[in-house]
């Protein structure tokens, strides 16, 4: 559900939304930390209806959701966090 990528690509998000998406309609979340060609952190959400949206990292709901997902992934519950190290 929650993925953290370190990438050398430029910014992926042209426009960001802060509109709430309940977790039940989210397929996965990709986090692109700032640096390596993009000056800001980006969050990309894949929805269950196959659409994709960039979410404002400052949106309160996404911060709450990521915290829940981090807690779940640090326990024995099946919500993996995948990380790619900087080459």
């Amino acid at each position: 559900v929650l993925e953290v990528y370190y990438t050398s690509l430029r910014c992926r998000c042209v426009q960001e939304s802060s509109v709430f998406i309940p977790r039940r309609f989210i397929d996965r979340i990709q986090i692109l930390p700032r640096g390596n060609g993009c000056p800001r952190k980006e969050i990309i959400v894949w929805k269950k209806n196959k659409s994709i949206v960039c979410v404002d990292p400052q949106a309160e709901w996404i911060q709450r959701m990521m915290e829940v997902l981090r807690k779940r992934s640090s326990s024995t519950l099946p919500v993996p966090v995948f990380k790619r190290k900087i080459p």
Epitope: I21, R24, V68, R72
Partner: antibody, heavy 123, light 106 residues
Amino acid sequence: EVQLVESGGGLVQPGGSLRLSCAASGFTFSSYAMSWVRQAPGKGLEWVATISEGGSDAYYPDNVKGRFTISRDNAKNSLYLQMNSLRAEDTAVYYCARDYYGSGYEESPMDYWGQGTLVTVSS
Amino acid sequence: DIQMTQSPSSLSASVGDRVTITCKASQDINKYIAWYQQKPGKAPKLLIHYTSTLQPGIPSRFSGSGSGTDFTFTISSLQPEDFATYYCLQYDNLYTFGGGTKLEIK
């Protein structure tokens, strides 16, 4: 007081189409996602579709995907369900329900429901 | 898809009894479960969401507990108006209702 009133049900032949409506009042319609849930005679509840508060996102279970389309008109405080290629197993009471508050961040489920409209698919 | 197995499917009890209904999810749903009451010919009514949060106006004799995959709904002391069918709903991953529990007068 939150009120949801469904209409448009009736008898339709297999393969036919029907459009259900739901008139909402007593709350800020454009701030809430909305859903349709159905109940076959003597059976349990089954989720059919959900649409986001602005109408840009719709979600369906696999058994109705491609046949049913949920839509809304926020100016008219109305929710719709267009049902095509209807089958006998689509026979049910169809309820519209208020879903999550789109301007918030609470993971709330459907809270208020209408009284339902009966759809019968039979030849 | 997440399956919700609700038990029992029917239950006979008397006024004043303590009644417990269970729902088991096929995978972890955190605490994202709701409970509804439905009377014949009527729309479902939300009683509890997020496992244990009572809706405004719902009597305190209704309660819920659990997390992960196993959840319980309890009526501490049955009242005449509580005889109805009860459904659980998971809303962690799309929506799935349990099969329902019909609560009848013994």
